[in-house]
């Protein structure tokens, strides 16, 4: 009875979600086994997000618009674990959007979900950030390691998608 | 005020290469947005080929994507179009123009465009 | 691609009259859709960004609205000048993709 109503809820929150989300997969997590974390298909998950690559080129405003859209947000990385998981799915002759702008152009980042930047976690390139004007962050693969560069806000860029994980 | 100047043959036999050059004054090329070549064929139908950008990267319209190459020389603050193995299809007028203004919300500042007619 | 389709083709209007091009785009936009002005032998001349912002030094007879797929540009009160050919191009996703034109003729 009680695994019964369980299964209950969680189609009923499936049906929820699948009006956002056509197709979620989901995988049993718990030291039970009995929660289900699910990540949109074709999304990839990571600890507690899921992640999207948008290979669509949109100025840094849209494609944070873009992920918005999908209940996500451009890509805050807050660890070198997540960020080696993002780019196995990354091309190394394109750059990304990340969730990271200096929208004054005074040196002060910020994360667009107001994660406190922190200096002592970042993984810009050697001689990055190098211009006020560049107000936006990318990931590329630059001098055989993958970092960030500050870049022209406007110029239309791929980007990376993150939202949390639907628990269910 | 930045001003964009296309200049190159306006004619160009079937087969060949057509290259082109927009002359940028005003702002340098190297300093911010991107830098685009579109054409308008015969018929007034408007087409984006592709751009390269003020850090030199590129981005070419799939539908040209073997025959294009966009390039620059920062020195003279040009920006240079070239399409292989031209047909009659690519006569058009070829504007240069830039792109990123209003947050890339449209584009404000064109060339005054050059016809190149491809005929034997 | 996200394809344009800008109507009507052609259009005749006279002097001081009231005239509306719309442009239909084949996925949601968000808005990020532009218009121009083309005289003959000429480049094009941004007249709206973003739907609805005018360009600087643009009458304010000019108007854009719309929002996701259908998108409208008015012209109130023609004037001489205003004839010509006019353009849409969405702005959201690279290629930007244009209308196939809108030819204002006067009546």
């Known amino acids: 009875n009680f695994m019964y109503s369980k299964t209950v809820k969680r189609l009923s929150k499936l049906q929820e979600y699948q009006q956002y989300y056509p197709s979620l997969t989901c995988v049993m997590e718990g030291k039970d086994m009995e929660d289900w974390s699910c990540c949109p298909t074709p999304w990839t998950s990571f600890q507690s997000s899921c992640y999207f690559i948008s290979t669509v080129m949109q100025s840094w405003t849209k494609s944070q618009n873009n992920c918005s859209v999908m209940g996500a947000d451009l890509v805050v990385i807050n660890t070198k674990e997540e960020q080696d998981f993002i780019t196995q799915n990354l091309k190394i002759n394109s750059a990304y959007f990340l969730g990271l702008s200096d929208p004054k152009g005074w040196r002060h980042w910020q994360w667009v979900d107001q994660t406190p930047y922190n200096k002592n976690v970042t993984f810009w390139h050697s001689g990055e950030p190098n211009s006020p004007d560049e107000r936006c962050a990318i990931i590329n693969f630059r001098s055989e390691e993958w970092g960030w560069n500050d870049v022209h806000c406007h110029v239309p860029q791929k980007s990376i998608c993150k939202m949390k994980k639907i628990y269910i | 005020d930045v001003q964009l100047q296309e200049s190159g043959p306006g004619l160009v036999k079937p087969s060949q290469s057509l290259s082109l050059t927009c002359s940028v004054t005003?702002?340098?090329?190297?300093?911010?947005?991107?830098w685009n070549w579109i054409r308008q064929f015969p018929g007034n139908k408007l087409e984006c080929m592709g751009y390269?950008?003020?850090?030199?990267?590129?981005y070419y319209n799939p539908s040209l994507k073997n025959r294009i190459s966009i390039t620059r020389d920062t020195s003279k603050n040009q920006f240079f179009l070239s399409l292989n193995s031209v047909t009659t299809e690519d006569t058009a007028t070829y504007f240069c123009v830039r792109g990123g203004d209003y947050d890339d919300g449209g584009f404000a500042y064109w060339g005054q465009g050059t016809l190149v007619t491809v005929s034997a | 691609d996200i394809q344009m389709t800008q109507s009507p083709a052609s259009l005749s209007a006279s002097v001081g009259e009231t005239v509306t091009i719309t442009c239909r785009a084949s996925?949601?936009?968000?808005?990020?859709l532009a218009w121009y002005q083309q005289k003959q032998g000429k480049s094009p001349q941004l007249l709206v960004y973003n739907a609805k912002t005018l360009a600087d030094g643009v009458p304010s007879r000019f108007s854009g609205s719309g929002s996701e797929t259908q998108y409208s540009l008015k012209i109130n009160s023609l004037q001489p000048e205003d004839f010509g050919n006019y353009f849409c191009?969405?702005?959201?996703?690279?290629?930007?993709?244009f209308g196939g034109g809108t030819k204002l003729e006067i009546k």
């Open positions: 005003g702002y340098s090329i190297t300093s911010g947005y991107y």
């Open positions: 390269i950008s003020y850090d030199g990267s590129n």
């Open positions: 191009q969405h702005f959201w996703i690279i290629p930007y993709t």
């Open positions: 996925g949601n936009i968000h808005n990020y």
